[in-house]
Each structure stands twice: as structure tokens, then as C-alpha cells.
Interface confidence: low
């Protein structure tokens, strides 16, 4: 396809408290150039979960090496899930811009639900 698509294959993921949640996201094209960000929620009040470009996100690890050229897999894993992490997570592609990057396209979202820790 000519135009980049952001694919979040799972509509929902259920994880037990204390476990790690893997949220999958893939791009269909390298261009336009720009970083990927993950958010919980949508709109002005959304919470930044991961920024490929900068920042420190101690609970988040990437499934593949994002700094490598040709990478189209932007899946993340969030460790030590708690009920407060429940919500819909969006993988968002930004277009390289100056001075600020511009939001280009968002995935459809993956709803994370948190089950009680097994006793």
C-alpha cells in the first residue's frame, strides 16, 4: 500500500495483575519518517506511555530494536501490571516536523483489562 497504516491486531488484551502486558503494533511503511508513541486514552487528556524518541519509561520495554533501520514492529511490553493500568492503548505514528513532530496516524487501539492476581 502507498500510505502507511498503523496496525494494532488485538482489540483487547487481558492480563493478571503483576504480570506483563504485550501490546502489539506494526507499521506497513517506513515513511513518512517520524517517531512512534504509545498513549493510554485518547484526546487531550491522554497519557503518554512510551515515546520512541525520548524519555524514560522504566516499566516499558520494546519487543524489537526500534533504533534499527527497517524496523516496522513497535510492540511494547508493560511490566508489573496493576488495575490502574486498565484502559485503551493507542499506538500513534508521528511525522517528523520542525519544531514539533505532527501526529500522522493512530492505530485502532487495544483495550487492556486487568484480572485479579490469582490467589
Amino acid at each position: 500500500e502507498d500510505e502507511l497504516q498503523v496496525i494494532q491486531p488485538e482489540k483487547s488484551v487481558s492480563v493478571a495483575a503483576g504480570e506483563s502486558a504485550t501490546l502489539r503494533c506494526a507499521m506497513t511503511s517506513l515513511i513518512p519518517v517520524g517517531p512512534i508513541m504509545w498513549f493510554r486514552g485518547a484526546g487531550a487528556g491522554r497519557e503518554l506511555i512510551y515515546n520512541q524518541k525520548e524519555g524514560h519509561f522504566p516499566r516499558v520495554t520494546t519487543v524489537s530494536e526500534l533504533t534499527k533501520r527497517n524496523n516496522l514492529d513497535f510492540s511494547i511490553s508493560i511490566s508489573n501490571i496493576t488495575p490502574a493500568d486498565a484502559g485503551t492503548y493507542y499506538c500513534v505514528k508521528f511525522r517528523k516536523g520542525s519544531p514539533d513532530d505532527v501526529e500522522f496516524k493512530s492505530g485502532a487501539g487495544t483495550e487492556l483489562s486487568v484480572r485479579a492476581k490469582p490467589s
Epitope: V33, K96, S98
Partner: antibody, heavy 118, light 107 residues
């Protein structure tokens, strides 16, 4: 050093196909996208598409979709561009170009002249 | 697709003179623009990327500036080997597109 060496000039008849090769050396072939760009005689540069040598995934310019096929052979670090149903206006120099660390096209192959003539 | 318009089409100058080539994009490409040099019978060579960064091994007499829709390539003092065709290219939007080229010829 990073080098791209292309196959030699070709003369084809209208309706035929041509397959141009681009052999890479001096870097990890599967680590960088390869693009193809063509240049008609006395004209400018026209992007045709790219191939991800790692996965084999491709992305073609709309103009060439259905006529172009980009492939690769990782065992010999070579990318290929095949153009079918050739017309006289496909006469051009065809270049492969590696997508460099800064996202731009660097370096380029030396070019392959494809002449389409009856 | 993004259209890049270069001007002038031809620039006639003498060695030692300053060359200024402009590239205008049909919509903003931020700073995501490159310049290439092509000599007769040769492949293009990357000169400037991200509007103003010189590629490896490119002499300091080449400089690039601009952002948004208007960009400039400047050669501060032309050397004999600089007479060639210069192309701008954008990669912010798909598909990547090139300008029509500017020929810098000896006056």
C-alpha cells in the same frame, strides 16, 4: 566501503521484461532498505519503490504497481528490479540506492541503461 | 504527491563565483529535504540532508538552508568539479519526490 554494483546495459523490445540486479558490499545487506530510481534521457529522477532486504517486503510507486517487482537474494547480497510490459518511454537509466543511516539515498549504484526499441 | 520546483533551471557562472539554487515544495516538508549532485554519466551523490547537514566527505563550500516550503543550496565559491546538475528531494511524504534539477554550467 559501501558499494552498489549494477548489471550491464540491456536492449529490449516493447512488451518484454527486464530484470536489473544490484549487488551490495561493504555493509550488512539486510540492514538497510534498497530503493530504485529511474532517469529518462535528459530528464529528472523518478522514485520507483523500495524493498526491505530483511523481510522481502516492498512498497512501489503507484505509477509502477502491477508492472514492477522488486526481489532480493540475501545469500549473495543482491537486489533485483524487474519491469514488465516495457514501453518506449521506459527507456531510462535505472539506479539502485541504499537508504542510508540518515534516511536518505546514499550511496547509489552506477546505473543500468535500459533501452526499449522495436 | 509533493511537487518540488527548482529554480533556475540553468545557472551560468564562472569558477570562484557563488551559486544559489532554490527548491520550493508544494506544501511544507519541514526540514526533511536533501540535495544531490549529478555529473554527466554518473549516479547522483548525496550532498546535504535534513535541509542543512552536509553528508560525509562533502566540502564546506556546500551549504543548505530553509525549512517548510522554501530551501536553498549555496555553493560559496565554485570549483571546476562543481559544474553539474543538482536535485532536491523530499522524504517526509510518500512517495519520495525529486525536483526537476538545476544545471550549473560554466559561463
Amino acid at each position: 566501503q559501501v558499494q552498489l554494483v549494477q548489471s550491464g546495459a540491456e536492449v529490449k523490445k516493447p512488451g518484454a521484461s527486464v530484470k536489473v540486479s544490484c549487488k551490495a558490499s561493504g555493509y550488512t545487506f539486510t540492514g538497510y532498505y534498497m530503493h530504485w530510481v529511474r532517469q529518462a534521457p535528459g530528464q529528472g529522477l523518478e522514485w520507483m519503490g523500495w524493498i526491505n532486504p530483511n523481510s522481502g517486503g516492498t512498497n512501489y510507486a503507484q505509477k509502477f504497481q502491477g508492472r514492477v517487482t522488486m526481489t532480493r537474494d540475501t545469500s549473495i547480497s543482491t537486489a533485483y528490479m524487474e519491469l514488465s510490459r516495457l514501453r518506449s518511454d521506459d527507456t531510462a537509466v535505472y539506479y539502485c540506492a541504499r537508504e542510508g543511516d540518515e534516511d536518505w539515498f546514499d550511496p547509489w549504484g552506477q546505473g543500468t541503461l535500459v533501452t526499449v526499441s522495436s | 504527491e509533493i511537487v518540488l520546483t527548482q529554480s533556475p533551471a540553468t545557472l551560468s557562472l564562472s569558477p570562484g563565483e557563488r551559486a544559489t539554487i532554490t527548491c520550493r515544495a508544494s506544501q511544507s516538508v519541514s526540514s526533511y529535504l536533501a540535495w544531490y549532485q549529478q555529473k554527466p554519466g554518473q549516479a547522483p551523490r548525496l550532498l546535504i540532508y535534513d535541509a542543512s547537514n552536509r553528508a560525509t566527505g562533502i566540502p564546506a563550500r556546500f551549504s543548505g538552508s530553509g525549512s517548510g516550503t522554501d530551501f536553498t543550496l549555496t555553493i560559496s565559491s565554485l570549483e571546476p568539479e562543481d559544474f553539474a546538475v543538482y536535485y532536491c528531494q523530499q522524504r517526509l511524504f510518500h512517495p519520495p519526490t525529486f525536483g526537476g534539477g538545476t544545471k550549473v554550467e560554466i559561463k
